[in-house]
């Protein structure tokens, strides 16, 4: 469940994160799992932790392996493994699926490539893209900040789209590329209002303390592709990430669904080792596309263990 | 110290068109969330408008949709309301308003211009 | 549409007086909610946030309370400086809405 995989290519940066989170003040302490050998954080080394951070700068083909973080507060440890594997550059134009990123549908009026994973990384606009290998050229092709338009999404505009970027690290300057495929829908539907199916508004959870619990936030936003919808969850008003208590993550990642051929977003909350402190906070369900924004408060109760009499 | 200055505003007749801009300083504009909010003469704030930081979301009050337009340019950290098919009823003071989060939905407005009026009449 | 509906529409006090503005929204809001301050011809100044976080610069004499549906705004002893408007605004829901306004007068 903590174990992430990260792919590079060779001599080119890679950044990764541990897979388990914690407040900025606390240390991540980083090993290569196969020698157990702790990994530098001085920079004058290729390979250096930076807090959460793992950095191949750049990246070698030997670095390829199992890495651990453990996550360390005054109270607890909390162990992450991020599986790395760095492959030698291609010398045709093809990318082999193993390098691709998720791939996105897009139709006419929803067009949007997001340049994967470019957040962990220092870099500044522009940036390039690449279609099939080929530079994109032409007034329909918009790079804006992190991600590709493109205007009048034809049936042809599908395929492998490559954003490039450079990673700048104390003033050396490093490439990454990232690779995605693209493919076009023919969009038949709408769009409305967020609507939260789960959980209920002001919905009490019971839960029992010392387990684990988890919290599914679940909304629809129409029919066909969606343009921009997200599910998230906020605690006491705040994001998950900047609340910065390690027990309570959020899924990587939205799981999209369909209910009465509406297109539906699920985001999980999990939270490990319920604590009496759980209790005392307003978890909030969180809805968004280009309509508006929605929330459902949720709030968890104790569940009491039913007595089991001899 | 931020600041938010707004301008463009003026009087035009029922049906026109303005274009206000609010340039900001002081801050990194292109993280925050901004919005538009409207008094009219004597009356209380109405929220009119917001948008990311990222100009992927733009919402509008009900009142303006599909006449008024917000859009930012990052590079000049100046934030825009097109608003065209003006009617009387947009009469008001226009406030410029910086968003007290990085995530555009906390909604809360830290910082304020100080206005500028925009009168419908014909 | 959320609605927030602020008590009392204005309230007349004097220097050093304890001074509470309620605001009920129509269906709850968790703890998004956010007070505002404003002067004649002045720009609103935010207050307090997330119902009860006072905002960097404010002084300690103000506070906010509650969740859900019912908030309150509350000045400990009332300065010459705080004879003002007051708004609160929900941001649980887009669109974002105000309460329609408390004068704070003199007496």
């Known amino acids: 469940k903590f174990s992430k995989q990260s792919w590079g290519l060779e001599n080119e940066a890679l950044i990764v994160r541990c897979p388990r989170q914690g407040k900025p003040s606390y240390t991540v302490d980083w090993y290569y799992s196969q020698t157990n050998k702790s990994i530098p954080t001085q920079e004058r080394n290729r390979v250096f932790a930076s807090g959460q951070l793992l950095k191949f700068l750049p990246a070698a083909v030997a670095d390829s392996g199992i890495y651990t973080c453990i996550v360390r507060s005054p109270t607890f440890n909390r162990t992450g493994y991020a599986n790395v594997t760095i492959y030698k550059k291609q010398s045709d134009c093809n990318v082999p699926d193993y390098l691709m990123y998720s791939t996105v549908s897009g139709s006419e009026k929803n067009s949007k490539i997001y340049c994967p994973t470019i957040d962990l990384y220092n870099w500044t606009a522009p940036l390039e893209w690449f279609k099939n290998c080929q530079a994109l050229q032409g007034s329909r092709y918009r790079a804006h900040k992190s991600f590709l338009v493109i205007d009048n999404v034809m049936t042809e505009d599908a395929g492998d789209y490559t954003c490039k970027f450079i990673h700048n690290e104390n003033g050396a300057n490093y490439s990454v590329t990232a690779t995605r495929s693209f493919t076009v829908k023919d969009e038949q539907g709408f769009s409305l209002f967020p609507v939260i199916g789960a959980p209920a508004q002001n919905e009490i959870k019971e839960v029992e303390i010392g387990k684990n619990a988890n919290l599914t936030c679940s909304a629809c936003f129409g029919k066909g592709t969606q343009f921009l919808a997200a599910v998230l969850w906020q605690l006491n008003g705040t994001k998950i990430t900047d609340f910065g208590e390690p027990r309570i993550q959020q899924e990587e990642g939205q799981n999209q669904s369909f209910s009465n051929g509406l297109a539906c977003l699920d985001m999980v909350l999990r939270i490990a080792d319920v604590k009496e402190e759980d209790l005392l906070l307003q978890y909030d369900c969180l809805a968004l596309n280009l309509h508006g924004l929605r929330r459902h408060t949720v709030r968890l109760s104790r569940k009491n263990p039913i007595d089991h009499h001899s | 110290e931020v600041q938010l200055l707004e301008s463009g505003g003026g009087l035009v007749k029922p049906g026109g068109s303005l274009r206000l801009s609010c340039a900001a300083s002081g801050f990194t504009f292109s993280s925050y969330a901004m919005s538009w909010v409207r008094q009219a003469p004597g009356k209380g704030l109405e929220w009119v408008s917001s948008i990311s930081s990222d100009s992927y979301y733009k919402y509008h009050a009900d009142s303006v949709k599909g006449r008024f337009t917000i859009s930012r340019d990052d590079s000049k950290n100046t934030l825009y309301l097109q608003m065209n098919s003006l009617k009387t009823e947009d009469t008001a003071v226009y406030y410029c308003?910086?968003?007290?989060?990085?995530?555009?939905?906390?909604?809360?407005?830290?910082?304020w211009g100080q206005g500028t009026l925009v009168t419908v009449s014909s | 549409d959320i609605q927030m509906t602020q008590s009392p529409s204005s309230l007349s006090a004097s220097v050093g007086d304890r001074v509470t503005i309620t605001c009920r929204a129509s269906?709850?809001?968790?703890?998004?909610l956010a007070w505002y301050q404003q002067k004649p011809g002045k720009a609103p100044k935010l207050l307090i946030y997330?119902?009860?976080t006072l905002q960097s610069g404010v002084p300690s004499r103000f506070s906010g309370s509650g969740s859900g549906t019912d908030f309150t705004l509350t000045i400990s002893s009332l300065q010459p400086e705080d004879f003002a408007t007051y708004y609160c605004?929900?941001?649980?829901?887009?669109?974002?809405t105000f309460g329609q306004s408390t004068k704070v007068e003199i007496k």
């Open positions: 997330r119902a009860s």
């Open positions: 605004q929900q941001s649980y829901n887009t669109p974002w």
């Open positions: 308003a910086k968003g007290a989060d990085y995530d555009f939905w906390s909604g809360y407005l830290d910082y």
């Open positions: 269906q709850g809001i968790s703890s998004y």
